[in-house]
Amino acid sequence: ECGHISVSAPIVHLGDPITASCIIKQNCSHLDPEPQILWRLGAELQPGGRQQRLSDGTQESIITLPHLNHTQAFLSCALNWGNSLQILDQVELRAGYPPAIPHNLSCLMNLTTSSLICQWEPGPETHLPTSFTLKSFKSRGNCQTQGDSILDCVPKDGQSHCSIPRKHLLLYQNMGIWVQAENALGTSMSPQLCLDPMDVVKLEPPMLRTMDPSPEAAPPQAGCLQLSWEPWQPGLHINQKCELRHKPQRGEASWALVGPLPLEALQYELCGLLPATAYTLQIRCIRWPLPGHWSDWSPSLELRTTERAPTHHHHHHHH
Protein backbone atom coordinates (compact mmCIF):
# COMPACT_ATOMS: atom_id res chain seq x y z
CA GLU A 1 0.00 0.00 0.00
CA CYS A 2 1.26 3.45 -0.90
CA GLY A 3 -0.30 5.52 1.84
CA HIS A 4 -0.87 5.26 5.56
CA ILE A 5 -2.99 7.42 7.85
CA SER A 6 -2.30 7.84 11.54
CA VAL A 7 -4.58 9.88 13.78
CA SER A 8 -4.10 11.60 17.14
CA ALA A 9 -7.02 9.52 18.46
CA PRO A 10 -9.54 7.42 16.54
CA ILE A 11 -12.23 8.14 19.15
CA VAL A 12 -12.77 11.61 20.56
CA HIS A 13 -15.35 13.68 22.40
CA LEU A 14 -17.99 14.91 19.98
CA GLY A 15 -16.94 18.37 18.76
CA ASP A 16 -13.27 17.96 19.70
CA PRO A 17 -10.45 18.53 17.19
CA ILE A 18 -8.59 15.66 15.61
CA THR A 19 -5.23 15.67 13.83
CA ALA A 20 -4.32 13.19 11.12
CA SER A 21 -1.21 12.48 9.09
CA CYS A 22 -1.01 10.73 5.71
CA ILE A 23 2.39 9.51 4.52
CA ILE A 24 3.08 8.37 0.94
CA LYS A 25 6.06 6.08 0.55
CA GLN A 26 8.84 7.08 -1.87
CA ASN A 27 8.82 3.72 -3.67
CA CYS A 28 5.40 4.41 -5.13
CA SER A 29 7.34 5.31 -8.35
CA HIS A 30 4.31 5.27 -10.59
CA LEU A 31 3.05 8.32 -8.77
CA ASP A 32 3.75 11.92 -9.51
CA PRO A 33 7.06 12.77 -7.79
CA GLU A 34 5.36 15.78 -6.20
CA PRO A 35 1.83 14.46 -5.62
CA GLN A 36 -0.82 16.62 -3.98
CA ILE A 37 -2.42 14.74 -1.12
CA LEU A 38 -6.11 15.41 -0.68
CA TRP A 39 -8.27 14.75 2.39
CA ARG A 40 -11.84 13.65 2.49
CA LEU A 41 -14.16 13.23 5.50
CA GLY A 42 -17.02 11.05 4.39
CA ALA A 43 -17.90 12.43 0.96
CA GLU A 44 -16.60 15.96 1.58
CA LEU A 45 -13.16 17.19 0.59
CA GLN A 46 -11.37 18.84 3.50
CA PRO A 47 -9.11 21.82 2.86
CA GLY A 48 -6.23 22.74 5.10
CA GLY A 49 -3.82 19.84 4.70
CA ARG A 50 -0.16 20.94 5.19
CA GLN A 51 2.12 18.90 2.92
CA GLN A 52 5.89 18.39 3.09
CA ARG A 53 8.61 16.08 1.76
CA LEU A 54 10.45 14.30 4.57
CA SER A 55 14.19 13.58 4.57
CA ASP A 56 13.65 9.94 3.53
CA GLY A 57 11.78 11.10 0.43
CA THR A 58 8.30 10.31 1.66
CA GLN A 59 5.50 12.83 1.33
CA GLU A 60 3.45 13.75 4.40
CA SER A 61 0.25 15.71 4.72
CA ILE A 62 -1.06 16.76 8.11
CA ILE A 63 -4.60 18.00 8.67
CA THR A 64 -6.40 19.23 11.76
CA LEU A 65 -10.17 18.96 11.79
CA PRO A 66 -11.18 21.66 14.29
CA HIS A 67 -14.44 19.98 15.35
CA LEU A 68 -15.41 16.39 14.73
CA ASN A 69 -19.19 16.74 14.68
CA HIS A 70 -19.94 13.35 13.17
CA THR A 71 -20.46 10.44 15.55
CA GLN A 72 -18.96 8.15 12.91
CA ALA A 73 -17.13 8.97 9.70
CA PHE A 74 -14.36 7.71 7.46
CA LEU A 75 -11.34 9.95 6.94
CA SER A 76 -9.37 9.18 3.81
CA CYS A 77 -6.32 10.57 2.08
CA ALA A 78 -6.20 10.37 -1.69
CA LEU A 79 -4.44 11.48 -4.88
CA ASN A 80 -5.84 12.73 -8.15
CA TRP A 81 -5.44 9.88 -10.60
CA GLY A 82 -6.57 10.86 -14.01
CA ASN A 83 -10.14 12.03 -13.64
CA SER A 84 -10.75 10.26 -10.33
CA LEU A 85 -9.53 10.20 -6.76
CA GLN A 86 -7.30 7.30 -5.85
CA ILE A 87 -7.80 6.54 -2.12
CA LEU A 88 -4.53 5.65 -0.45
CA ASP A 89 -5.79 4.87 3.04
CA GLN A 90 -8.78 5.47 5.27
CA VAL A 91 -9.54 5.25 8.97
CA GLU A 92 -12.80 5.17 10.86
CA LEU A 93 -13.27 8.06 13.24
CA ARG A 94 -15.75 7.86 16.12
CA ALA A 95 -16.95 10.68 18.31
CA GLY A 96 -19.25 10.63 21.28
CA TYR A 97 -19.35 11.10 25.01
CA PRO A 98 -18.02 9.26 28.04
CA PRO A 99 -20.78 7.35 29.83
CA ALA A 100 -22.96 9.31 32.21
CA ILE A 101 -23.39 7.93 35.70
CA PRO A 102 -26.07 5.19 35.52
CA HIS A 103 -28.97 6.21 37.75
CA ASN A 104 -32.14 4.89 39.36
CA LEU A 105 -30.58 1.51 40.12
CA SER A 106 -33.16 -0.71 41.81
CA CYS A 107 -33.47 -4.42 42.49
CA LEU A 108 -36.22 -7.00 43.05
CA MET A 109 -35.88 -10.44 44.58
CA ASN A 110 -37.92 -12.99 42.65
CA LEU A 111 -38.52 -16.05 44.81
CA THR A 112 -39.82 -18.11 41.90
CA THR A 113 -36.75 -17.70 39.70
CA SER A 114 -34.53 -17.47 42.80
CA SER A 115 -32.74 -14.45 41.41
CA LEU A 116 -32.11 -10.80 42.23
CA ILE A 117 -33.10 -8.72 39.22
CA CYS A 118 -31.56 -5.26 39.07
CA GLN A 119 -32.37 -2.52 36.57
CA TRP A 120 -31.06 0.96 35.92
CA GLU A 121 -31.28 3.91 33.56
CA PRO A 122 -28.16 4.19 31.43
CA GLY A 123 -28.34 7.93 30.83
CA PRO A 124 -28.00 9.84 27.55
CA GLU A 125 -26.76 8.24 24.32
CA THR A 126 -22.97 8.15 24.14
CA HIS A 127 -22.83 7.35 20.39
CA LEU A 128 -20.08 4.85 21.22
CA PRO A 129 -20.07 1.17 22.13
CA THR A 130 -20.69 1.30 25.89
CA SER A 131 -20.67 -1.72 28.18
CA PHE A 132 -22.58 -1.99 31.43
CA THR A 133 -21.63 -4.34 34.24
CA LEU A 134 -23.60 -5.02 37.40
CA LYS A 135 -21.03 -5.43 40.14
CA SER A 136 -21.66 -6.66 43.66
CA PHE A 137 -20.12 -8.02 46.82
CA LYS A 138 -21.29 -9.70 50.00
CA SER A 139 -21.01 -7.74 53.21
CA ARG A 140 -21.51 -8.68 56.85
CA GLY A 141 -22.31 -5.11 57.85
CA ASN A 142 -23.71 -2.06 56.12
CA CYS A 143 -21.52 -2.46 53.01
CA GLN A 144 -18.71 -0.28 54.40
CA THR A 145 -16.53 -3.38 54.55
CA GLN A 146 -16.39 -5.52 51.42
CA GLY A 147 -16.69 -9.28 51.71
CA ASP A 148 -16.52 -11.82 48.89
CA SER A 149 -16.94 -10.37 45.42
CA ILE A 150 -19.77 -11.78 43.35
CA LEU A 151 -19.27 -12.70 39.72
CA ASP A 152 -20.00 -9.70 37.46
CA CYS A 153 -23.39 -9.72 35.82
CA VAL A 154 -23.24 -8.59 32.20
CA PRO A 155 -26.57 -7.75 30.55
CA LYS A 156 -27.39 -8.75 27.01
CA ASP A 157 -26.67 -6.04 24.44
CA GLY A 158 -28.98 -3.08 24.75
CA GLN A 159 -30.56 -4.24 28.02
CA SER A 160 -30.49 -2.21 31.21
CA HIS A 161 -31.15 -5.05 33.62
CA CYS A 162 -29.35 -8.11 34.87
CA SER A 163 -30.17 -11.11 37.08
CA ILE A 164 -27.89 -12.37 39.84
CA PRO A 165 -28.67 -16.08 40.35
CA ARG A 166 -29.37 -17.62 43.76
CA LYS A 167 -25.97 -19.31 44.01
CA HIS A 168 -24.36 -15.85 44.25
CA LEU A 169 -26.86 -14.50 46.79
CA LEU A 170 -26.93 -14.64 50.56
CA LEU A 171 -30.37 -13.98 51.96
CA TYR A 172 -30.68 -11.98 55.19
CA GLN A 173 -27.24 -10.52 54.55
CA ASN A 174 -26.39 -7.22 52.92
CA MET A 175 -24.93 -6.90 49.45
CA GLY A 176 -23.24 -3.91 47.86
CA ILE A 177 -24.48 -3.43 44.29
CA TRP A 178 -23.60 -0.88 41.65
CA VAL A 179 -23.45 -0.47 37.88
CA GLN A 180 -20.26 0.36 36.01
CA ALA A 181 -20.50 1.89 32.54
CA GLU A 182 -17.44 1.93 30.29
CA ASN A 183 -16.51 3.09 26.81
CA ALA A 184 -13.42 4.31 25.00
CA LEU A 185 -13.75 7.76 26.56
CA GLY A 186 -14.15 6.81 30.18
CA THR A 187 -15.77 4.88 33.01
CA SER A 188 -18.54 5.85 35.40
CA MET A 189 -20.17 4.15 38.36
CA SER A 190 -23.63 4.46 39.82
CA PRO A 191 -24.12 5.14 43.50
CA GLN A 192 -23.92 1.89 45.45
CA LEU A 193 -27.01 0.16 46.80
CA CYS A 194 -26.69 -1.73 50.06
CA LEU A 195 -29.49 -4.25 50.44
CA ASP A 196 -30.57 -7.59 51.81
CA PRO A 197 -32.22 -9.46 48.91
CA MET A 198 -35.17 -10.38 51.14
CA ASP A 199 -35.87 -6.69 51.74
CA VAL A 200 -36.60 -6.21 48.04
CA VAL A 201 -38.73 -9.35 47.66
CA LYS A 202 -41.62 -9.03 45.24
CA LEU A 203 -44.37 -11.54 45.93
CA GLU A 204 -46.94 -12.92 43.56
CA PRO A 205 -50.47 -11.69 44.29
CA PRO A 206 -53.16 -13.92 45.80
CA MET A 207 -55.86 -15.32 43.53
CA LEU A 208 -59.26 -13.70 44.06
CA ARG A 209 -62.28 -15.99 44.16
CA THR A 210 -66.01 -15.72 44.73
CA MET A 211 -66.89 -16.90 48.21
CA ASP A 212 -68.76 -20.19 48.03
CA PRO A 213 -72.19 -19.66 49.57
CA SER A 214 -72.67 -21.93 52.56
CA PRO A 215 -76.12 -22.91 53.88
CA GLU A 216 -75.52 -21.38 57.32
CA ALA A 217 -74.01 -18.12 56.03
CA ALA A 218 -76.26 -15.15 55.38
CA PRO A 219 -76.40 -13.99 51.76
CA PRO A 220 -74.55 -10.75 51.02
CA GLN A 221 -76.38 -7.59 52.02
CA ALA A 222 -77.54 -5.30 49.27
CA GLY A 223 -74.68 -3.28 47.81
CA CYS A 224 -72.17 -5.81 49.19
CA LEU A 225 -69.87 -8.38 47.64
CA GLN A 226 -68.43 -11.46 49.32
CA LEU A 227 -65.04 -12.59 48.09
CA SER A 228 -62.12 -14.69 49.22
CA TRP A 229 -58.53 -15.14 48.13
CA GLU A 230 -56.02 -17.92 47.88
CA PRO A 231 -52.54 -16.76 48.97
CA TRP A 232 -49.54 -17.46 46.77
CA GLN A 233 -48.24 -20.63 48.41
CA PRO A 234 -44.47 -20.02 48.17
CA GLY A 235 -44.92 -16.71 49.99
CA LEU A 236 -47.30 -18.07 52.60
CA HIS A 237 -44.83 -17.80 55.51
CA ILE A 238 -43.98 -14.16 54.75
CA ASN A 239 -46.04 -11.71 56.78
CA GLN A 240 -47.86 -9.46 54.37
CA LYS A 241 -50.48 -6.78 54.12
CA CYS A 242 -52.78 -6.56 51.14
CA GLU A 243 -55.09 -4.09 49.49
CA LEU A 244 -58.11 -4.46 47.25
CA ARG A 245 -59.19 -2.14 44.51
CA HIS A 246 -62.55 -2.09 42.78
CA LYS A 247 -64.47 -0.14 40.19
CA PRO A 248 -67.73 -0.52 38.28
CA GLN A 249 -67.20 -2.31 34.98
CA ARG A 250 -69.18 0.30 33.08
CA GLY A 251 -68.45 4.00 33.03
CA GLU A 252 -65.31 5.98 33.68
CA ALA A 253 -65.05 5.56 37.44
CA SER A 254 -61.51 5.32 38.80
CA TRP A 255 -60.32 2.55 41.10
CA ALA A 256 -61.34 2.75 44.77
CA LEU A 257 -58.80 1.35 47.22
CA VAL A 258 -59.64 -0.73 50.29
CA GLY A 259 -57.04 -1.68 52.86
CA PRO A 260 -54.77 -2.51 54.43
CA LEU A 261 -56.05 -6.07 54.78
CA PRO A 262 -54.09 -8.82 56.46
CA LEU A 263 -53.24 -11.61 54.02
CA GLU A 264 -54.71 -14.01 56.54
CA ALA A 265 -58.19 -12.47 56.36
CA LEU A 266 -58.67 -14.82 53.38
CA GLN A 267 -62.25 -13.61 52.97
CA TYR A 268 -63.89 -10.24 52.92
CA GLU A 269 -67.27 -8.60 52.64
CA LEU A 270 -67.08 -5.38 50.68
CA CYS A 271 -70.02 -3.03 51.21
CA GLY A 272 -71.12 0.47 50.28
CA LEU A 273 -71.28 -0.37 46.57
CA LEU A 274 -73.90 0.45 43.99
CA PRO A 275 -76.73 -2.10 43.84
CA ALA A 276 -77.19 -4.30 40.77
CA THR A 277 -73.79 -3.28 39.44
CA ALA A 278 -71.00 -5.38 37.98
CA TYR A 279 -67.63 -4.65 39.61
CA THR A 280 -64.05 -5.48 38.70
CA LEU A 281 -61.84 -6.32 41.69
CA GLN A 282 -58.10 -6.89 42.12
CA ILE A 283 -55.79 -7.55 45.07
CA ARG A 284 -52.08 -7.07 45.70
CA CYS A 285 -49.80 -7.69 48.68
CA ILE A 286 -46.48 -6.59 50.13
CA ARG A 287 -44.12 -8.07 52.71
CA TRP A 288 -44.93 -6.27 55.95
CA PRO A 289 -43.88 -5.06 58.51
CA LEU A 290 -40.50 -5.96 57.02
CA PRO A 291 -39.46 -4.17 53.81
CA GLY A 292 -40.52 -5.42 50.39
CA HIS A 293 -42.08 -4.45 47.06
CA TRP A 294 -45.76 -4.51 46.18
CA SER A 295 -46.80 -7.46 44.09
CA ASP A 296 -48.47 -6.83 40.77
CA TRP A 297 -52.24 -6.57 40.88
CA SER A 298 -53.94 -9.94 40.68
CA PRO A 299 -55.98 -11.02 37.68
CA SER A 300 -59.41 -9.38 37.85
CA LEU A 301 -62.44 -10.93 39.49
CA GLU A 302 -65.79 -9.77 38.19
CA LEU A 303 -68.77 -9.82 40.57
CA ARG A 304 -72.23 -8.28 40.62
CA THR A 305 -73.92 -6.71 43.63
CA THR A 306 -77.47 -7.70 44.56
CA GLU A 307 -80.54 -5.88 43.22
CA ARG A 308 -82.03 -4.41 46.39
CA ALA A 309 -81.11 -0.94 47.61
CA PRO A 310 -78.16 -0.98 50.00
CA THR A 311 -78.91 -0.73 53.72
CA HIS A 312 -75.32 -0.57 55.03
CA HIS A 313 -72.30 1.40 53.90
CA HIS A 314 -69.28 -0.03 55.67
CA HIS A 315 -66.30 -2.31 55.26
CA HIS A 316 -65.59 -5.18 57.54
CA HIS A 317 -63.90 -8.54 57.26
CA HIS A 318 -64.49 -11.96 58.74
CA HIS A 319 -61.86 -14.35 60.03
Epitope: P231, I238, E264
Partner: antibody
Protein backbone atom coordinates in the same frame (compact mmCIF):
# COMPACT_ATOMS: atom_id res chain seq x y z
CA UNK B 1 -31.49 -16.67 72.55
CA UNK B 2 -34.44 -18.45 70.93
CA UNK B 3 -35.94 -21.12 73.17
CA UNK B 4 -38.86 -23.48 72.58
CA UNK B 5 -40.01 -25.71 75.40
CA UNK B 6 -42.62 -28.41 74.78
CA UNK B 7 -44.76 -29.98 77.50
CA UNK B 8 -47.89 -32.08 77.83
CA UNK B 9 -46.65 -35.36 76.42
CA UNK B 10 -47.26 -38.69 78.10
CA UNK B 11 -49.03 -42.03 77.93
CA UNK B 12 -52.61 -42.03 76.68
CA UNK B 13 -55.04 -44.76 75.66
CA UNK B 14 -56.25 -45.11 72.05
CA UNK B 15 -59.19 -42.78 71.48
CA UNK B 16 -57.97 -40.45 74.22
CA UNK B 17 -56.92 -36.81 74.07
CA UNK B 18 -53.82 -34.83 74.93
CA UNK B 19 -52.88 -31.18 74.67
CA UNK B 20 -49.29 -30.23 73.92
CA UNK B 21 -47.93 -26.78 74.72
CA UNK B 22 -44.83 -25.00 73.50
CA UNK B 23 -43.56 -21.98 75.41
CA UNK B 24 -41.50 -19.65 73.21
CA UNK B 25 -38.97 -17.01 74.24
CA UNK B 26 -36.12 -14.97 72.78
CA UNK B 27 -37.97 -13.69 69.71
CA UNK B 28 -41.12 -11.80 68.72
CA UNK B 29 -43.48 -14.75 68.76
CA UNK B 30 -46.38 -12.94 67.07
CA UNK B 31 -44.37 -12.34 63.90
CA UNK B 32 -43.60 -15.96 63.07
CA UNK B 33 -45.36 -19.00 61.75
CA UNK B 34 -44.99 -21.93 64.12
CA UNK B 35 -45.37 -25.65 63.52
CA UNK B 36 -45.39 -29.17 64.91
CA UNK B 37 -43.27 -32.00 63.48
CA UNK B 38 -43.28 -35.52 64.86
CA UNK B 39 -40.95 -38.49 64.75
CA UNK B 40 -42.13 -42.03 65.45
CA UNK B 41 -39.56 -44.24 67.24
CA UNK B 42 -36.78 -45.18 64.82
CA UNK B 43 -38.49 -43.35 61.91
CA UNK B 44 -38.05 -40.15 59.98
CA UNK B 45 -39.56 -36.69 60.43
CA UNK B 46 -43.23 -36.06 59.63
CA UNK B 47 -44.80 -32.61 59.40
CA UNK B 48 -48.02 -32.43 61.42
CA UNK B 49 -49.36 -28.88 61.26
CA UNK B 50 -48.39 -25.22 61.04
CA UNK B 51 -50.06 -21.98 62.05
CA UNK B 52 -49.67 -18.48 60.66
CA UNK B 53 -48.48 -15.56 62.78
CA UNK B 54 -51.96 -14.42 63.78
CA UNK B 55 -53.54 -17.87 63.67
CA UNK B 56 -55.73 -17.41 60.59
CA UNK B 57 -54.14 -20.12 58.45
CA UNK B 58 -53.78 -23.66 59.83
CA UNK B 59 -52.83 -26.41 57.37
CA UNK B 60 -52.71 -30.03 58.59
CA UNK B 61 -51.23 -33.31 57.41
CA UNK B 62 -53.90 -35.66 56.04
CA UNK B 63 -53.02 -38.18 58.75
CA UNK B 64 -54.21 -35.85 61.54
CA UNK B 65 -56.85 -33.72 59.79
CA UNK B 66 -60.09 -33.57 61.78
CA UNK B 67 -58.44 -34.99 64.91
CA UNK B 68 -55.73 -32.46 65.77
CA UNK B 69 -56.13 -28.70 66.23
CA UNK B 70 -53.24 -26.26 66.24
CA UNK B 71 -53.66 -22.89 67.97
CA UNK B 72 -51.60 -20.13 69.50
CA UNK B 73 -51.86 -17.45 72.16
CA UNK B 74 -49.65 -14.56 71.10
CA UNK B 75 -50.19 -12.78 74.44
CA UNK B 76 -48.67 -15.81 76.21
CA UNK B 77 -46.07 -16.66 73.55
CA UNK B 78 -47.43 -20.18 73.50
CA UNK B 79 -48.24 -22.69 70.77
CA UNK B 80 -50.68 -25.56 71.30
CA UNK B 81 -51.60 -28.85 69.70
CA UNK B 82 -54.89 -30.38 70.80
CA UNK B 83 -54.85 -34.08 69.90
CA UNK B 84 -58.13 -36.01 69.97
CA UNK B 85 -59.07 -39.57 68.93
CA UNK B 86 -55.47 -40.62 69.35
CA UNK B 87 -54.26 -43.78 67.64
CA UNK B 88 -51.27 -46.09 68.19
CA UNK B 89 -49.66 -44.66 65.03
CA UNK B 90 -49.63 -41.17 66.64
CA UNK B 91 -46.95 -42.43 69.06
CA UNK B 92 -43.95 -40.17 68.45
CA UNK B 93 -41.74 -37.43 69.78
CA UNK B 94 -43.53 -34.16 68.97
CA UNK B 95 -41.32 -31.17 68.20
CA UNK B 96 -42.44 -27.56 68.23
CA UNK B 97 -40.63 -25.39 65.67
CA UNK B 98 -40.30 -21.76 64.64
CA UNK B 99 -40.62 -21.23 60.88
CA UNK B 100 -38.71 -18.82 58.70
CA UNK B 101 -40.11 -16.76 55.81
CA UNK B 102 -39.19 -19.44 53.29
CA UNK B 103 -40.92 -22.23 55.21
CA UNK B 104 -37.76 -23.57 56.83
CA UNK B 105 -37.95 -24.88 60.42
CA UNK B 106 -35.40 -22.47 61.87
CA UNK B 107 -35.42 -23.54 65.52
CA UNK B 108 -36.71 -26.68 67.22
CA UNK B 109 -37.72 -27.52 70.75
CA UNK B 110 -36.26 -30.54 72.52
CA UNK B 111 -39.42 -32.57 71.87
CA UNK B 112 -42.05 -34.26 74.03
CA UNK B 113 -42.91 -37.95 73.80
CA UNK B 114 -46.51 -39.00 73.22
CA UNK B 115 -47.24 -42.70 73.66
CA UNK B 116 -50.62 -44.06 72.62
CA UNK B 117 -51.09 -47.54 74.03
CA UNK B 118 -53.63 -49.58 75.91
CA UNK C 1 -48.79 -33.86 47.23
CA UNK C 2 -45.05 -33.46 46.75
CA UNK C 3 -42.92 -36.51 47.59
CA UNK C 4 -39.28 -36.12 48.59
CA UNK C 5 -36.86 -38.96 47.85
CA UNK C 6 -33.44 -38.97 49.49
CA UNK C 7 -30.47 -41.09 48.50
CA UNK C 8 -28.61 -42.94 49.72
CA UNK C 9 -30.56 -44.01 52.82
CA UNK C 10 -27.24 -44.61 54.55
CA UNK C 11 -23.54 -44.27 53.83
CA UNK C 12 -20.24 -45.03 55.53
CA UNK C 13 -17.45 -42.50 55.32
CA UNK C 14 -14.22 -41.50 57.02
CA UNK C 15 -13.18 -38.23 58.62
CA UNK C 16 -11.93 -35.91 55.88
CA UNK C 17 -14.09 -37.48 53.15
CA UNK C 18 -16.24 -35.45 50.83
CA UNK C 19 -19.85 -36.57 51.25
CA UNK C 20 -22.76 -35.90 48.90
CA UNK C 21 -26.44 -36.55 49.65
CA UNK C 22 -29.13 -36.04 47.04
CA UNK C 23 -32.80 -35.19 47.33
CA UNK C 24 -35.35 -35.38 44.53
CA UNK C 25 -38.79 -33.76 44.52
CA UNK C 26 -41.70 -35.38 42.67
CA UNK C 27 -42.42 -32.00 41.05
CA UNK C 28 -40.62 -28.67 40.69
CA UNK C 29 -40.16 -26.77 43.95
CA UNK C 30 -38.01 -23.87 42.68
CA UNK C 31 -35.43 -23.34 45.48
CA UNK C 32 -37.72 -24.19 48.38
CA UNK C 33 -35.55 -26.99 49.76
CA UNK C 34 -34.10 -27.14 53.28
CA UNK C 35 -31.59 -29.50 54.91
CA UNK C 36 -31.48 -30.61 58.54
CA UNK C 37 -29.04 -32.57 60.70
CA UNK C 38 -30.24 -34.78 63.54
CA UNK C 39 -28.14 -36.61 66.09
CA UNK C 40 -29.54 -39.51 68.17
CA UNK C 41 -31.83 -38.33 70.98
CA UNK C 42 -31.61 -34.70 69.84
CA UNK C 43 -33.86 -32.31 67.96
CA UNK C 44 -33.12 -31.64 64.29
CA UNK C 45 -31.02 -28.59 63.42
CA UNK C 46 -31.40 -26.44 60.30
CA UNK C 47 -28.26 -26.47 58.12
CA UNK C 48 -29.31 -24.96 54.79
CA UNK C 49 -32.47 -23.20 53.62
CA UNK C 50 -33.72 -22.11 50.21
CA UNK C 51 -31.42 -24.70 48.58
CA UNK C 52 -28.09 -22.98 49.18
CA UNK C 53 -28.24 -20.51 52.07
CA UNK C 54 -26.17 -21.52 55.06
CA UNK C 55 -28.00 -21.03 58.36
CA UNK C 56 -26.14 -18.78 60.83
CA UNK C 57 -23.57 -20.68 62.86
CA UNK C 58 -23.35 -23.66 60.50
CA UNK C 59 -19.77 -24.46 59.37
CA UNK C 60 -18.92 -23.54 55.78
CA UNK C 61 -17.98 -27.14 54.95
CA UNK C 62 -21.74 -27.67 54.47
CA UNK C 63 -23.14 -26.46 51.15
CA UNK C 64 -26.31 -26.96 49.17
CA UNK C 65 -27.09 -26.72 45.48
CA UNK C 66 -29.78 -27.49 42.94
CA UNK C 67 -33.15 -26.14 41.90
CA UNK C 68 -36.37 -27.45 40.46
CA UNK C 69 -36.44 -31.15 41.35
CA UNK C 70 -32.83 -32.17 42.07
CA UNK C 71 -30.85 -30.98 45.08
CA UNK C 72 -27.57 -31.85 46.75
CA UNK C 73 -26.11 -31.45 50.22
CA UNK C 74 -22.32 -31.59 50.27
CA UNK C 75 -20.01 -31.88 53.26
CA UNK C 76 -16.60 -30.94 51.85
CA UNK C 77 -14.51 -32.55 54.58
CA UNK C 78 -16.37 -34.77 57.03
CA UNK C 79 -15.66 -34.06 60.71
CA UNK C 80 -16.29 -36.39 63.67
CA UNK C 81 -19.29 -34.28 64.79
CA UNK C 82 -20.93 -34.65 61.35
CA UNK C 83 -21.89 -38.31 61.85
CA UNK C 84 -25.68 -37.98 62.04
CA UNK C 85 -28.87 -38.37 60.01
CA UNK C 86 -29.66 -35.72 57.39
CA UNK C 87 -33.12 -34.82 56.12
CA UNK C 88 -34.32 -32.66 53.23
CA UNK C 89 -37.67 -30.84 53.33
CA UNK C 90 -39.66 -28.97 50.72
CA UNK C 91 -41.34 -25.74 51.81
CA UNK C 92 -42.98 -24.44 48.63
CA UNK C 93 -46.44 -25.44 49.85
CA UNK C 94 -48.55 -27.62 52.07
CA UNK C 95 -48.70 -30.41 52.99
CA UNK C 96 -45.08 -30.11 54.06
CA UNK C 97 -42.90 -33.13 53.36
CA UNK C 98 -39.53 -34.47 54.45
CA UNK C 99 -37.23 -36.92 52.74
CA UNK C 100 -36.71 -40.31 54.35
CA UNK C 101 -33.31 -39.35 55.76
CA UNK C 102 -29.68 -40.31 55.11
CA UNK C 103 -27.67 -41.82 57.94
CA UNK C 104 -23.96 -40.94 57.75
CA UNK C 105 -21.95 -43.54 59.70
CA UNK C 106 -18.27 -43.97 60.50
CA UNK C 107 -16.48 -46.38 58.15
Amino acid sequence: EVQLLESGGGLVQPGGSLRLSCAASGFTFSLYWMGWVRQAPGKGLEWVSSISSSGGVTPYADSVKGRFTISRDNSKNTLYLQMNSLRAEDTAVYYCAKLGELGQFMRWGQGTLVTVSS
Amino acid sequence: DIQMTQSPSSLSASVGDRVTITCRASQGISSYLNWYQQKPGKAPKLLIYYASNLQNGVPSRFSGSGSGTDFTLTISSLQPEDFATYYCQQSIGYPGSFGGGTKVEIK
